[in-house]
């Protein structure tokens, strides 16, 4: 007789979970020398071990200490990009400009990215079919605790000038619920940053506005600023030749604003 | 080229009021934060207000019941209105642009015009 | 308000010197400090902010350092251009508060 089973409103666990995280760590820790130490088998014991056999809805930032200690990695911390809303342009930004790094360059990012997981409370069991969704379910869900947590420790070590890429295009181009706007922006320390700048993103191609006038972006701008944190804005009118830039910055066409 | 201009500076006998104007070119007071600087003759510099983009205002607590800052984003003018003027208010007053949007340091600054308070 | 102290208030040295002006805060101020040049009758000119960034178009011979409460401002080889008054300011709280200035001129 099948077990009864919790049906929830999100998708279930992404198909060979177990196998993509560990197969993503032993890449990972190939390409980067500085992470070669870690031992992947213990990684992915410390993943499952945050929400296996754990009620999917109870899920808190100490259940993923063990793992955060084993993927405990120091990148440079004046070289931090944010983003919201805009993962695929912030990726491309950093293949290109490889001193600089969004929370997917770093292992625990890496593993986790575009993945979802959950248990059940009192089995064993990967729960495949469904997992709680953020808004209909649950906030304390196994993937939204495990974004809060990394994202948190990501935003506390940076320093100098944090960069965050914006997406010009959404109706709210910095909004409070995202994870930057609810967890990122809040655990950046004033004590180690200087200045937050926003790059904001243009969708179109004869889109000439300034977006850094945007409401959200002066709220941004509010937030940052009542924490002793500069804030500077910018317009990226033309992603496409922004990247071509960053690519090759010596281009005669780069002088002008991109 | 940015440019910052002030002007309203004079001679002003104690308890009166002035107004100071800072006119700038080659950058928008909507992207930019403003602050008024003074110097009194021969001494060091005291920052005095800001004003940042979007209007809302910063002072120095020894100012703040006798000073406004204000600004006219349409004619590129950011204003120091000084009440109750006294012989220590004599110095130099800088307006200066914020070096980024929302920056506390001050990276082009006007040549001052010199407020003389004596009766 | 946060007090800057700098010192020296004057110095008189050779071109080509190496000049370094301190500046002390009563308080950690994370580096929240930028340097300023005045030459007579002039406005004050942002020379290095954050402690040890130096602006676009300055020259290299000035350099800064410092972290904590203590910060170091340094002209590694003095020039006749040089002569002036250097003041450091920190942002790190309003009122943003300026040292008193260290006056340098050429023995």
């Known amino acids: 007789v099948p077990r009864w089973r919790q049906q929830w409103s999100g998708p279930g666990t992404t198909k060979r979970f177990p196998e993509t995280v560990l197969a993503r760590c032993v890449k990972y820790t190939e390409i980067h020398p500085e992470m070669r130490h870690v031992d992947c088998q213990s990684v992915w014991d410390a993943f499952k071990g945050a929400f296996i056999s754990k009620h999917p809805c109870n899920i808190t930032e100490e259940d993923y200490q063990p793992l955060m200690k084993l993927g405990t990695q120091t990148v440079p911390c004046n070289k931090i990009l944010l983003w919201s809303r805009i993962k695929d342009l912030a990726h491309q930004f950093t293949q290109v400009q490889r001193d600089m790094f969004t929370l997917e360059d770093t292992l625990l990012g890496y593993l986790a990215d575009d993945l979802t997981w959950c248990g059940e409370f009192n089995t064993s069991k990967i729960n495949y079919q469904s997992c709680p969704d953020w808004r209909k379910d649950c906030s304390n869900n196994p993937v939204s605790v495990f974004w809060k947590t990394v994202s948190r420790r990501f935003a506390e070590a940076a320093c100098d000038v944090v960069h965050v890429m914006l997406n010009g295009s959404r109706s709210k181009i910095f909004d409070k619920n995202s994870t930057f706007g609810s967890v990122e922006v809040h655990n950046l320390q004033p004590e180690k940053v200087q200045t937050l700048e926003a790059w904001v993103i243009h969708g179109g191609r004869e889109d000439s506005r300034d977006l850094c006038q945007d409401p959200t972006i002066k709220e941004l701008e509010s937030i940052i600023s009542k924490r002793n944190i500069q804030f500077s804005c910018k317009n990226i009118y033309r992603p496409d030749k922004f990247l071509q830039c960053v690519k090759n910055p010596e281009d005669s066409s780069c002088t002008s604003e991109i | 080229e940015v440019q910052l201009v002030e002007s309203g500076g004079g001679v002003v006998q104690p308890g009166r009021s002035l107004r100071l104007s800072c006119a700038v070119s080659g950058f928008s007071l909507l992207s930019y934060g403003v602050h008024w600087v003074r110097q009194a003759p021969g001494k060091g510099l005291e920052w005095v207000a800001v004003?940042?983009?979007?209007?809302?205002?910063d002072y120095n607590a020894a100012f703040m019941s006798r000073f406004t800052i204000s600004k006219d984003n349409s004619k590129s003018t950011v204003y120091l209105q000084m009440n109750s003027l006294r012989a220590e208010d004599t110095a130099v007053y800088y307006c200066?642009?914020?070096?980024?949007?929302?920056?506390?340091?001050?990276?082009?600054w006007g040549q001052g015009t010199l407020v003389t308070v004596s009766s | 308000d946060i007090q800057m102290t700098q010192s020296p208030s004057s110095l008189s040295a050779s071109v080509g010197d190496r000049v370094t002006i301190t500046c002390k805060a009563s308080e950690d101020i994370y580096n929240r400090l930028a340097w300023y040049q005045q030459k007579p009758g002039k406005a004050p000119k942002l020379l290095i902010s954050g402690a040890t960034s130096l602006e676009t178009g300055v020259p290299s011979r000035f350099s800064g350092s410092g972290s904590g409460k203590d910060y170091t401002f340094t002209i590694s080889s003095l020039q006749p251009e040089d002569v002036a008054t250097y003041y450091c300011?920190?942002?790190?709280?309003?009122?943003?508060?300026f040292g008193q200035g260290t006056k340098v001129e050429i023995k």
């Open positions: 004003i940042w983009r979007g209007g809302s205002a």
């Open positions: 300011q920190q942002f790190w709280n309003t009122p943003w508060t």
């Open positions: 200066a642009k914020s070096m980024i949007t929302t920056g506390f340091t001050l990276d082009y």
